[in-house]
């Protein structure tokens, strides 16, 4: 047999070398680049276990697009062909609660997880006789790289062998800690920098495969919180880095997500973006904002990927989009998952399993409202999947997707065995579709959430309510005393008000300047390499927020430390939820805070407020009747008509879709 | 700056009438929705009602349809909540709130408060069984 090369197992404390040897059917299907479904023999262990895989058709496109640029800089647009892909997901016969995450694109890898243990499988380099390692996931030598605060053992859950009938695969695949019974979709973008790329031999098919074969392993963590990952865009920075990465991990992941911000979301929609980095920040694997998964400003992370496998490189990305999902860590809480860690474990341990308090946290984001994006099933024109009927994705073709049939006798409206709408039906699902009928325009779809924020309407042709949008940025709100900034009124009253309870409000500004001037975790203007630093006056309304009149302590599922400051006759109150380095400290005065006349907060720092750029004259452009919105046109107040509230209307703008209908009595009484 | 101001609350006995006056200054009310939400102690404010800009649509709690009416004078820059047959658990603050840009109608769902930028005070309503 062939030895493996140095290269290949210098990372492993302990491996095996097997010949797996595939099953065949006697009924074989038509020739095709790779099969929908195939099962292999293969030892681990000493043990034979035979492995049922189907091909992950709710992963990747058939209008894979790729964004790269060229020597100029220009936007390159790429939509290769890969709807026979090679990305399997699946389970081993007879063992409980197992799942499998492989690809059998040029021989077995990816990971196998059973019940006490996950391995993975990769072919050997130069065997001619289909040779492959198998290790123990825990036999990988990892830097002890952290999101955090340090490692805890977890206590062992037992699992209970149940007998029971085999299950199908998409039984098998859904019955794992389901959290909670309606299926999320989180549709993941994910960004490649340039260090990353060069370090794949500036080889794009490489890349891509490898993100993929990360997204199929993501989607197989995932699918035990009933959460399938869809992976709707790649960007490669071929031609250099369209951000600063120079700094600590924070300021990385600032510039990340204003860039995704500005740039990226108008380019495809997508619920949260993760940045793929060589560049390390000296022993931090990653960072990612807490519960902003729906957000257009923070839903996204950063992550390391240096001398580690795609396979341990999963359960960071895991972890910091957990972290999107609403995850805290599980340090120092009451959490199990069956391993000796966790993959919210701060520690990056490399862990393939989410823990019972992250099935909580998901559930608390779900509940608070702050997971509604993940309801939509990606569109066809968005989801990289192959089409197929039957997958609860509605695919290139579709129409609509009731599921399995059993499913689809539930569903008035859809047909499933085609995957098209019944003949009386308009539409089958979607904000603006009821009793298999599109809902009259001025339908209200999405109402206001804030002062800041505009409403959306039916147009009545569509299934889909318009796209949100909201103020644009820099408009004044609270009587001038803040201003917009996406889509929220930002002022330290209601910051503080989150926090410590209705009652609360901003401590005065001498506590600011004397608590964030000490440079600690109570107070500070950041982070920066591996130490707090201190708020110049000038910047210490920007730093750790300080409350006064607090009458309730905070509860967030993570109990944080309070910190009670005396200053000229009053108490400041600030908090540290110690989330981690990995983690932006929610106890922060909000980015876009008005923080003196004419400023804002942004980074820390108490900037001019001209960064915002607003730009609209309301008296000017919406004739004193109406508001900007964040596509810069105007939202008409009731009795004016868009696009310029000139004339005497029904409200709304060129965005929000009609406000009124004669005929609409939606809920009329 | 819009204000708006409540009155008309007080203590009454169950199956009593009782009607809640809102005046709104700073702004004519013609462009404005205008709503009532409620708040007993130790719960959630809820929704009571609201009547579109136009006056054209009204959308009413289920926990008080039938007995609940709203109507608006743009005139007066006035809205008014006729509340009949008062149940024990009608007892909570009421507020009022308007907003320009919720139009108040075409809805399929209850409004929520954060649909309205404007609030009065508040008025207490008691009705004692």
């Known amino acids: 047999a062939a030895r493996p090369g140095f290269q290949q197992t210098s990372h492993l404390s302990s491996y095996e070398i097997i010949t797996p040897w595939r099953l065949t059917r006697e009924r074989r299907e038509a020739p095709r680049p790779y099969s929908k479904q195939v099962s292999y023999v293969i030892q681990a262990e000493g043990k034979e276990h035979i492995i049922h895989l189907e091909r992950n058709k709710d992963l990747l496109p058939e209008d894979f697009v790729v964004y790269t640029y060229n020597k100029e800089g220009t936007l390159i647009t790429d939509h290769p062909n890969i709807q026979n892909h090679c990305h399997y997901r699946g389970y081993v016969e007879g063992v409980h609660n197992s799942s499998i995450a492989l690809s059998d694109c040029f021989g077995l890898r990816g990971l196998l997880h059973l019940e006490n243990a996950s391995y993975g499988i990769e072919p050997l380099q130069n065997s001619s006789h289909f040779e492959h390692i198998i290790y123990r996931m825990d036999d990988v030598y990892k830097e002890p790289l952290k999101c955090g605060v340090s490692n805890k053992d977890i206590e062992k859950e037992t699992a209970k062998d149940e007998e029971e009938e085999p299950p199908s695969m998409t039984q098998l695949l859904r019955r794992r800690r389901a959290v909670l019974p309606q299926t999320r979709y989180v549709e993941l973008f994910i960004v490649v920098d340039k260090e990353r790329y060069d370090m794949m031999g500036r080889n794009q098919t490489a890349v891509r495969e490898e993100m993929i074969l990360l997204a199929n392993y993501l989607d197989s963590m995932y699918i035990m919180l009933n959460i399938r990952i869809v992976l709707v865009g790649l960007e490669i920075w071929t031609n250099g880095n369209l951000i600063n990465i120079v700094g600590g991990a924070g300021d990385v992941l600032g510039n990340f997500v204003q860039w995704r911000e500005k740039f990226l979301i108008t380019r495809r929609r997508h619920d949260s973006a993760q940045l793929v980095l060589k560049k390390g920040f000296g022993g931090t694997a990653g960072m990612a904002f807490v519960g902003t998964v729906c957000s257009r400003s923070h839903a996204g992370g950063i992550n390391v990927f240096g001398q580690i496998t795609v396979e341990t490189f999963a359960s960071i990305v895991a972890h910091e989009l957990g972290h999107n999902l609403g995850m805290n860590h599980d340090d120092g809480r009451d959490c199990s998952c069956g391993a000796k860690s966790c993959i919210m474990n701060s520690g990056a341990s490399g862990s393939r399993n989410f823990s019972s308090c992250s099935a909580e946290d998901f559930e608390k984001l779900t509940l608070n409202k702050g997971g509604n994006c993940l309801l939509n099933i990606p569109k066809p024109d968005e989801a990289y999947s192959a089409p197929s009927c039957g997958n609860k994705l509605v695919d290139a073709g579709e129409e609509c997707d009731c599921g399995t049939p059993k499913e689809c006798e539930l569903d008035p409206c859809c047909e499933g065995s085609t995957c098209k709408l019944k003949s009386f039906a308009e539409c089958a699902y979607g904000d603006c579709c009821k009793d298999c009928r599109f809902l009259p325009g001025g339908t209200l779809c999405r109402g206001k959430t804030s002062e800041c924020d505009v409403p959306e309407y039916c147009n009545g042709s569509s299934q889909f309510c318009q796209p949100d949008v909201f103020i644009q940025n820099g408009y004044p709100c609270q009587n001038n005393k803040a201003y917009c900034y996406n889509g929220m009124c930002q002022y330290y009253d209601a910051q503080c008000q989150v926090i410590f309870g209705s009652k609360a409000k901003a401590a005065p500004k001498d506590c600011f300047i004397e608590v964030n001037s000490k440079g600690d975790r109570f107070g500070n203007c950041g982070f920066s390499g591996n130490e707090y630093k201190k708020c110049a006056t000038g910047n210490a309304l920007c730093g750790k927020l300080q409350c006064e009149n607090v009458q309730e302590i905070p509860v967030f599922g993570i109990v944080p430390a309070i910190i009670q400051t005396p200053s000229r006759g009053t108490k400041c109150w600030g908090v540290d939820f110690q989330l981690g380095s990995d983690v932006p400290d929610p106890g922060m005065v909000n980015e876009g805070t008005k923080c003196g006349a004419g400023k804002i907060c942004r980074n820390f720092q108490c900037v001019d407020a001209s960064v915002l750029n607003y730009d609209c004259d309301v008296q000017k452009k919406c004739h004193g009747h109406g508001v900007c919105n964040s596509n810069k046109n105007c939202h008409c107040e009731n009795g004016w008509a868009p696009p310029n509230c000139e004339t005497k209307g029904y409200g709304g703008s060129v965005d929000s879709g009609p406000t009124y209908n004669e005929m609409n009595t939606a809920l009329r009484d | 700056e819009v204000q708006l101001v409540e009155s008309g609350g007080g203590l009454v006995q169950a199956g009593d009438s009782l009607r809640l006056s809102c005046a709104v200054s700073g702004r004519t009310i013609s462009s404005y929705a205008v709503g009532w939400f409620r708040q007993a102690p130790g719960k959630e404010r809820e929704f009571v009602a609201v009547i579109s800009w136009t006056g054209g649509s009204t959308y009413f709690a289920d926990s008080v349809k039938g007995r609940f009416t709203i109507s608006r004078d743009n005139a007066k820059n006035t809205v008014y909540l006729q509340m009949n047959n008062l149940k024990s658990e009608d007892t909570a603050v009421y507020y009022c709130?308007?907003?320009?840009?919720?139009?108040?109608?075409?809805?399929?769902?209850?409004?929520?408060?954060?649909?309205?930028?404007?609030w009065g005070q508040g008025i207490q309503v008691t009705v004692s069984s």
């Open positions: 709130t308007a907003d320009r840009f919720t139009t108040g109608s075409g809805r399929t769902s209850y409004p929520r408060p954060s649909e309205f930028d404007h």
